[in-house]
């Protein structure tokens, strides 16, 4: 008799793929306009990335550092009108993209929650949640919560409002903290909160250290759903050496939890890609016209257009990973087991019941390595085969689809491999 299938876990929409942050409409659109109407025209691009949610804004009225000039219920006219926003929501819904609205109050100013602990603003966030929930948004983000007095109790209250409206609504909190204890204390009182932090950017970017960070986090959070990013805002390139970008994309998409990216991460956009642009709002490089300052020769492979035409590009890798992440059960909600690893690399298995299993091997080192993967510390349900098929490599030139011997895996410097193998009863 065949073994009984495991019950599928309840999956919310944010469990099924990546979230994509557009914190600056002008930077993202890159055409000087930067408004909600213009954003609508880029929804097809977001669909092509297979992201499940768009974390938008903030777009509310905020006079720098002025509480009285801040209105969480009003859209800054520079970004458009409530009608434009309603139209964006409608179009996004048709493309199955959820909209998460950033309500960080003083986003133009020095301190996101104003210079003193302004309780009146935090109190009014709850009215704003109700207002925008009624308007049809799918969730909210608030950043820099370490600057908010009584953050845990406010988050619990906001979570109640969000969940009270619908279990299908998401609350994301962001913190600059990389301290696990601080992160856990924020998560403790807030079930279902998605927390973005600087936890992973606290790494020395070795395989051993990254493995230790990831496993500590997963052990400490237990069966809570995680999110993975290197910061609460900002680009991967601001935190990572360039040669590790592909490796981190692979890791963020294959760890158990929701990967959260910022616009431009998919093409390796750098904060200062365009001279004279502020670091916080890099201009998205759609095509060569996005940067009049850089020679066309070097620029094509940095743009969305150029990378879309190149199957070996970072963008193509992102799309492939996003596609796998959103359709494979083992990656959607599978169990995670780290394998014993050396200082240069980190490897783990994702598996769910009788579905196809995935093995991720990441070489963080500057030198190639031969890795003999041992299954000594794996439970019986996650045993390793002798060979696994190569689904993709972060480096071009590999013969994808071919079986690789796990006892004698060879990896290039900074190479990551995603391998698959079937369940065997």
């Amino acid at each position: 008799r065949a073994p009984r299938c495991r019950d599928l876990p309840v999956q919310k929409w944010w469990h099924t793929g990546a979230l994509y942050r557009i914190g600056d409409l002008q930077g993202f659109q890159g055409n000087g306009a930067g408004n909600l109407a213009g954003l609508k025209g880029h929804l097809d691009y977001l669909s092509s990335l297979k992201v499940k949610g768009l974390v938008l804004g903030p777009i509310h009225k905020n006079q720098k550092d002025d509480v009285a000039g801040t209105d969480l219920l009003q859209i800054d006219p520079n970004f458009g009108s409530k009608e434009d926003f309603a139209s964006l929501l409608q179009s996004a819904k048709k493309k199955s993209i959820r909209i998460i609205l950033d309500l960080t109050p003083n986003y133009q100013g020095e301190n996101s929650w104003f210079s003193t602990q302004v309780d009146t603003v935090a109190t009014k966030v709850k009215d704003a949640l109700e207002f925008w929930l009624q308007a049809g948004v799918d969730g909210f983000q608030v950043r820099d919560i370490e600057n908010l007095k009584d953050a845990s109790s406010f988050l619990a209250e906001w979570q109640n409002i969000t969940k009270g409206f619908s279990e299908d609504r998401l609350l994301i909190a962001g913190t600059n903290s990389s301290d696990l204890q601080q992160i856990l204390s924020l998560l403790e009182s807030n079930k279902d909160l998605l927390l973005t932090s600087s936890y992973l950017s606290n790494s020395s970017f070795t395989g051993e250290h990254t493995k230790s960070l990831v496993t500590q986090y997963l052990n400490a959070t237990g069966n809570r759903w995680c999110s993975w990013s290197l910061s609460q805002a900002g680009l991967l390139t601001s935190f990572l050496p360039a040669q590790l970008l592909r490796l981190y994309q692979l890791m963020l998409f294959t760890l158990p939890g929701t990967p959260v990216f910022s616009y431009g991460d998919e093409i390796g956009l750098e904060a200062a890609a365009v001279p004279g642009q502020p670091v916080e709002a890099p201009v998205m490089l759609w095509d060569e016209s996005s940067f009049p300052f850089i020679s066309a020769a070097g620029s094509a492979n940095m743009t969305v257009k150029g990378q879309s035409e190149d199957p070996g590009s970072l963008l193509s890798l992102f799309r492939r990973l996003s596609d796998q992440r959103s359709k494979e059960r083992s990656l959607l909600h599978g169990d995670f087991h780290a394998l014993s690893s050396g200082p240069g690399f980190f490897s783990y298995i994702r598996h769910w019941d009788q579905n196809e299993r995935f093995l991720v091997v990441l070489n963080f080192g500057d030198v190639g390595l031969s890795a003999g993967l041992q299954a000594s510390d794996l439970p019986a349900s996650a045993s390793l085969p002798a060979k696994a098929d190569l689904l993709l490599s972060t480096q071009p030139g590999r013969d994808e689809g071919s079986p690789l011997e796990l006892e004698r895996l060879k990896l290039e410097p900074h190479e990551g491999l995603l391998l698959r193998f079937p369940y065997v009863a």
Partner: antibody
Framework: QVQLQESGPGLVKPSETLSLTCTVS????????WSWIRQPPGKGLEWIGY???????NYNPSLKSRVTISVDTSKNQFSLKLSSVTAADTAVYYC?????????WGQGTLVTVSS | DIVMTQSQKFMSTSVGDRVSVTCKAS??????VAWYQKKPGQPPKALIY???YRYSGVPDRFTGSGSGTDFTLTISNVQSEDLAEYFC?????????FGSGTKLEIK
Amino acid sequence: QVQLQESGPGLVKPSETLSLTCTVSGGSISSSYWSWIRQPPGKGLEWIGYIYNSGSTNYNPSLKSRVTISVDTSKNQFSLKLSSVTAADTAVYYCARETYYFDYWGQGTLVTVSS
Amino acid sequence: DIVMTQSQKFMSTSVGDRVSVTCKASQNVGINVAWYQKKPGQPPKALIYSAAYRYSGVPDRFTGSGSGTDFTLTISNVQSEDLAEYFCQQYNSYPLTFGSGTKLEIK
């Protein structure tokens, strides 16, 4: 230009409920905060509470057990009910729009609590 | 609750003079303070918000200053129509609270 006008009885008996209505004209009651404030004779101003068009309210803890503020968006009105009144509730009652501070006020209406 | 103290109940001044009305908060309220002018039989009128920003239509002889716990409303070149009571209000924390008021008398 937003204008506010309070209406309601000027005399209420002790232990009864004081009821006032504020009509907003020249603008929509939606997506703003609407407050009640009072000033007893010879004293300072006291904030009673606000309502937001979703029906969300925030009351002064000193009055919370006796206060109800409600909104009728179809009539562009919001109302105050203050129960179990005593002579200490005698005051000029103002309705106002709150943007953290109060930028538009009604003329105010004097309510006397007396038997 | 945050207590806003206006220690001077009355202030006497002459037309053309400069006068300063003060207000002290019982705890740090940043710049989250507004000032109002109230004349008998009329509702209060907003003069200043965020401690120093003049509300639209308010003459520039009214200026606000201060942050933290100490705030000042200054009227330079006092006019006879400035005869009124002046209130401060904090909006840093709920409940919103007002000062007890300072009455300006013209000599």
